[in-house]
Amino acid sequence: QDPWAAEPRSACGPSSCYALFPRRRTFLEAWRACRELGGDLATPRTPEEAQRVDNLVGAGPASRLLWIGLQRQARQCQLQRPLRGFTWTTGDQDTAFTNWAQPATGGPCPAQRCVALEASGEHRWLEGSCTLAVDGYLCQFGFEGACPALQDEAGQAGPAVYTTPFHLVSTEFEWLPFGSVAAVQCQAGRGASLLCVKQPEGGVGWSRAGPLCLGAGCSPDNGGCEHECVEEVDGHVSCRCTEGFRLAADGRSCEDPCAQAPCEQQCEPGGPQGYSCHCRLGFRPAEDDPHRCVDTDECQIAGVCQQMCVNYVGGFECYCSEGHELEADGISCSPAGAMGARASQDLGDELLDDGEDEEDEDEAWEAFGGGWTEMPGILWMEPTQPPDFALAYRPSFPEDREPQIPYPEPTWPPPLSAPRVPYHSSVLSVTRPVVVSATRPTLPSAHQPPVIPATHPALSRDHQIPVIAANYPDLPSAYQPGILSVSHPAQPPAHQPPMISTRYPELFPAHQSPMFPDTQVAGTQTTTHLPAIPPNRAPLVTTLGAHQPPQAPDAPVLRTQATQLPIIPTAQPSLTTSSRSPVSPAHQVSVPAATQPPALPTLLPSQSPTNQTSPISPTHPHSKVPQIPREDGPSPKLALWLPSAAPTAAPTALGEASLAEHIQRDDRWL
């Protein structure tokens, strides 16, 4: 099949899927599109993973390119290393495979670069400008387990149709990620829908065992049951619904209590009414009607901004008066011109080489903006209570299979995401020390629950999703805005969620987040034009829920390829890099632990509500903070505070000064 047909296609193994999206996108747009589907740009770190990518891409045209998840900041060349100074978007440089098109050549690496894979031939890696919209991109979706494809049964009317959590529909999968739906049509009746779920005894499996189309009692029409038919001991048939659904009055069909959209923002099955409503970060339930959400006015909190504060729907921004500029903490103001100098000092003089010519001096801010910053955020807690988020996955997405990107404008990610499905790489980083910035104030111990590794798939209903509060360390808890649950009582102290401090962004050199330099926007514009966040611009958080009605997908069926691969042990003291370089096809490079230096910490610029970068959850066991590509830059006068998901107790200022109708692109990171 031609991978350049209109529809995406995928190939799944027992622990991850790759998907090819033939959509013209810049690197940032591609990264966002993968993130919004719960994945990441592809990171083929081993020869086995690369083989799966090869099988998926096939023999495409030489003129076409696909983004993969590799990027490098300006002047970050490390030509002696396998990735040459490039970093995976998952935040690390570990690899056991490379496929560069050319041998490394010396050079100053003056500009930021991203990597695209050739669609033809050997699928070599090429580097180039990140702002070019290449022909497509490869996403990778990791998960804890997968269900094998169903065996065809004699009574089936056709092959099972599978819908994955990342919206691909096909009859051709060999492995189905946790959370996938299988729709089986039977000759004698309406058939059955199954969900790939977590099994009580461990592992994952289909929500019901076969045979699906044969047998007495529940045959031939599933006993008239919409979901599950149970043959009781006395011979009569009773119907049951999968988790999150309730049996309708007719005793046969199942209804989703959230299907009628009773909640303004987020709905979750369960509770006395069959559902409970929740509000996103920056909103709280209306006192007169818990189904509605009203904006939390953070500007009413004393000291939230040093000078001026503007509240808008779903968030707030700090401003400074004329002659002052916003500091990197997004709160404080300093006399204009003071910040840049201090920022340079913080970075170290090595970034600004006095010996460089005019061109290099012009790029000093690029070097500054191109550093790495820890993206702090949400800790996902131990399984103690039902989650405080609606599980927004529906098995059939006729209109949503393509990531909803208003191209060429960057997307509007959700303000807060449920935990991402962890991506378990077969290559574990054992080399990078965690260096905590010594300048961040220590928060009270009650605000720092233990880090629980995100090893459960995102659908697991026993995941605790915390109530997130924008906690300012110097304020009493009564002033802390956050997501409020209508249906759950306050948590006891033992399960107190982590508090997000918007005041002290934390710098972890080991966990890297991309940076972008400043954007040219007049301060007068930013202080008078404050676009509110549109409520419906962001797609639903793609988490997986067992409560959705299993149904035959109505989306077009895609052909896929699947390759079963051996599971590689995840603890390796060192990595061997196999390279498909045309110069040395069998080249093996040993990467000792000592060769992984931490990157320089860098202050984090701000970002406006017109172009928010998705908050992200851990997707990789050895780097809890993925890279966040950015095409826009910061303004010293503007900052938007949003939480991001990383295993720390402090959030990050994600802000930029581009206006809604004037979004600039750049070759650099946030």
Epitope: P61, A101, T105, A111, E118, T131, L132, A133
Partner: antibody, heavy 124, light 108 residues
Framework: QVQLVQSGPEVKKPGASVKLSCKAS????????IHWVKQAPGQRLEWMGY????????TYNQKFKGQVTITVDTSASTAYMELNSLRSEDTAVYYC?????????????????WGQGTLVTVSS | DIQLTQSPSFLSASVGDRVTITCRAS??????VAWYQQKPGKAPKLLIY???NRYTGVPSRFSGSGSGTEFTLTISSMQPEDLATYFC??????????FGQGTKLEIK
């Protein structure tokens, strides 16, 4: 070596049509996108549109949409551009150019080879 | 559309001179900029791609620099055969290429 050879000069009356050709040699024709660029006297170069010979995918500059049609004959390794409803302001040199895919391990979308150009004169 | 403005439009230089041509973009184009040389009656030839990479076979006296909105083509030592018009081109919003108006380089 790579070559793009364009058809000869044309003189047309207003309202007429003209079809220009661009024959490629020295490389695999379906591996590279072909662009067409206009250079009117005293004016800057203007991108008109492209075709990918691999799958006939075309995209046009909004300014020329409706007036221009780009096609290929892969068996002849030739790209064509037809200009309809000619006006005096269509008097220009028209170039076909190949978009590069990669240079020395870099991908890039600059135009690495150009035809010699075809002068089209529109005059009553 | 992204506009490119070259300066100067005309330039006279002597053999051996260092020549600098500037190209400004109306908005950020990253490094998606190329430079072309066009001799009278001929087709343009690619000199520099991706803002700073010299194309195969181009003499080392030609160099490019810049990123974002400001780009420079430099001829370190002007030669008689460099008499030509030089164009910058951006392609960050590919396939919508735009070109600068050109800089005509003459020999003094």
């Amino acid at each position: 070596q790579v070559q793009l050879v364009q058809s000869g000069p044309e003189v047309k009356k207003p309202g007429a049509s003209v079809k220009l050709s661009c024959k490629a040699s020295g490389y695999t024709f379906t591996d590279y996108v072909i662009h067409w660029v206009k250079q009117a006297p005293g004016q800057r170069l203007e991108w008109m549109g492209y075709i990918n010979p691999y799958d006939d995918d075309t995209t046009y500059n909004q300014k020329f949409k409706g007036q221009v049609t780009i096609t290929v004959d892969t068996s002849a390794s030739t790209a064509y551009m037809e200009l309809n409803s000619l006006r005096s302001e269509d008097t220009a040199v028209y170039y076909c150019a190949r978009r590069g895919n990669s240079y020395d391990g870099y991908f890039d979308y600059s135009m690495d080879y150009w035809g010699q150009g075809t002068l089209v004169t529109v005059s009553s | 559309d992204i506009q490119l403005t070259q300066s100067p439009s005309f330039l006279s230089a002597s053999v051996g001179d260092r020549v600098t041509i500037t190209c400004r973009a109306s908005q950020n184009v990253g490094t998606a900029v190329a430079w072309y040389q066009q001799k009278p009656g001929k087709a343009p030839k690619l000199l520099i791609y991706s803002a700073s990479n010299r194309y195969t076979g181009v003499p080392s006296r030609f160099s490019g620099s810049g990123s974002g909105t400001e780009f420079t083509l430099t001829i370190s030592s002007m030669q008689p055969e460099d008499l030509a018009t030089y164009f910058c081109q951006q392609y960050t919003n590919y396939p919508m290429y735009t070109f600068g108006q050109g800089t005509k380089l003459e020999i003094k």
